[in-house]
Amino acid sequence: NSLFNQEVQIPLTESYCGPCPKNWICYKNNCYQFFNESKNWYESQASCMSQNASLLKVYSKEDQDLLKLVKSYHWMGLVHIPTNGSWQWEDGSILSPNLLTIIEMQKGDCALYASSFKGYIENCSIPNTYICMQRTV
Amino acid sequence: NSLFNQEVQIPLTESYCGPCPKNWICYKNNCYQFFNESKNWYESQASCMSQNASLLKVYSKEDQDLLKLVKSYHWMGLVHIPTNGSWQWEDGSILSPNLLTIIEMQKGDCALYASSFKGYIENCSIPNTYICMQRTV
């Protein structure tokens, strides 16, 4: 039990969110962090993985409505599969219809998240800021 | 002890955030919520107060760096005191130097928060979206 160091009691009127890595944003029990340093998609993915997280996965407009207000463009975990033309997440799941509107910024197989649930296609080797996400159980 | 219903153990590698009102954003133990419906400043303040919160107070670029990425304009808890020309928060504290860049949108005594720590002066009776904030102890 050595990893645990706190016991907290939670009032019914309020709730704790998490657990998340320290100083990450917690919303509806998902953890998010925005990273300022620009990396290409592969480096961004590696950075998230090193923190036991993945690049942003958009799975619900309701549970992730905080993403509506995000400014600028950031790598997310969505990649194009040229063989069948589909877009899929790092975990292999296919992008659901009407979750994101995908627009070509330039030819590429990776996607940047932009406000209001838009995704912009970009060359995977271009450096951009990125969003990591960790889903709590 | 009737208000409490959970006991949780927190690993040292991760941490819980809060407590916050249900479905609010928690970041560095502050709680934030963005409200879509447009209200004037006074109605926005009343809405936050009804939820045991206040309009957004910007007190630290470090602790509130998530605000850098906020898109659009939203009422915050900053008002102009015509008698001495200062800007102060709802709790009576004076706006610290270099925290916000204040820009006149139009003549007024209230301020909208915009990305990258900018504040836009606006007529208090104009409807806008708003940000409520609750500081955890």
């Epitope: 033309g85 589909s86 877009w87 992008l95 219809p97 009407n98 994101l100 509107t101 995908i102 627009i103 070509e104 910024m105 330039q106 030819k107 209001s116 649930f117 838009k118 912009y120 296609i121 060359n123 | -």
Partner: antibody
Framework: EVQLLESGGGLVQPGGSLRLSCAAS????????MTWVRQAPGKGLEWVSI????????FYADSVKGRFTISRDNSRNTLYLQMDSLRAEDTAVYYC??????????????WGQGTLVTVSS | SYVLTQPPSVSVAPGQTARITCGGN??????VHWYQQKAGQAPVLVVY???DRPSGIPERFSGSNSGNTATLTISRVEAGDEADYYC???????????FGGGTKLTVL
């Protein structure tokens, strides 16, 4: 087979309004973005507006922004274009077209036959 | 905003190859789509994503795209290919669809 049928065109005075409709069939309407493209007499194609499958995202050409509103009713498989404050330069054949990729704004795979809008006093 | 430049007209004899260009700043980094519009008819997509053909479009129609120029090539031109041809891209910076001015293909 994909079918797109525009209606609602006609003669209108400058400053007036008109609402175009596009009835769609032969595909799952709600997952495809739809667009309006116009063509003035003897001129080239000009994009007007596009709307995502869910209706969450709308984009407009600068020439119509603030005057035209694109919308859709996915329960009726119908696309609309509300045109207000019409000008003589809005005179054109208006085509509705279906996006070629269900998840992406890319190209226009299917087109209707068009409806003529004439703005004149 | 992004601009696409096409020659107003191209003429070719039947059986020859027609090449219609579409110029734009670094257009090779964008996916280009081509439409054919015959007189009095609605446009028809003939090439998308630079070089892919929709079903029903003859193999004689092909596309390429690099640098600052995209090209629609029509080999073994037939009289029925006489039409206006338009290139199109998405400008992701402005969230606008952009069409070229169109090229009238005349079969001599």
């Amino acid at each position: 087979e994909v079918q797109l049928l525009e209606s609602g065109g006609g003669l209108v005075q400058p400053g007036g309004s008109l609402r175009l409709s596009c009835a769609a069939s032969g595909f799952t309407f709600s997952i495809y973005a739809m667009t309006w493209v116009r063509q003035a007499p003897g001129k080239g194609l000009e994009w007007v507006s596009i709307i995502s499958g869910s209706g969450d995202h709308t984009f407009y050409a600068d020439s119509v922004k603030g005057r035209f509103t694109i919308s859709r009713d996915n329960s009726r498989n119908t696309l609309y274009l509300q045109m207000d404050s019409l000008r003589a330069e809005d005179t054109a054949v208006y085509y509705c077209a279906k996006e070629g990729k269900w998840v992406q704004l890319s190209h226009f795979a299917n087109w209707g036959q068009g409806t003529l809008v004439t703005v004149s006093s | 905003s992004y601009v696409l430049t096409q020659p107003p007209s191209v003429s070719v004899a039947p059986g020859q190859t027609a090449r219609i260009t579409c110029g734009g700043n670094n257009i090779g980094s964008k996916s280009v789509h081509w439409y054919q519009q015959k007189a009095g008819q609605a446009p028809v997509l003939v090439v998308y994503d630079d070089s892919d053909r929709p079903s029903g479009i003859p193999e004689r129609f092909s596309g390429s795209n690099s640098g600052n120029t995209a090209t629609l090539t029509i080999s073994r031109v037939e009289a029925g290919d006489e039409a206006d041809y338009y290139c199109q891209v998405w400008d992701g910076r402005s969230d606008h669809v952009v069409f070229g001015g169109g090229t009238k293909l005349t079969v001599l």
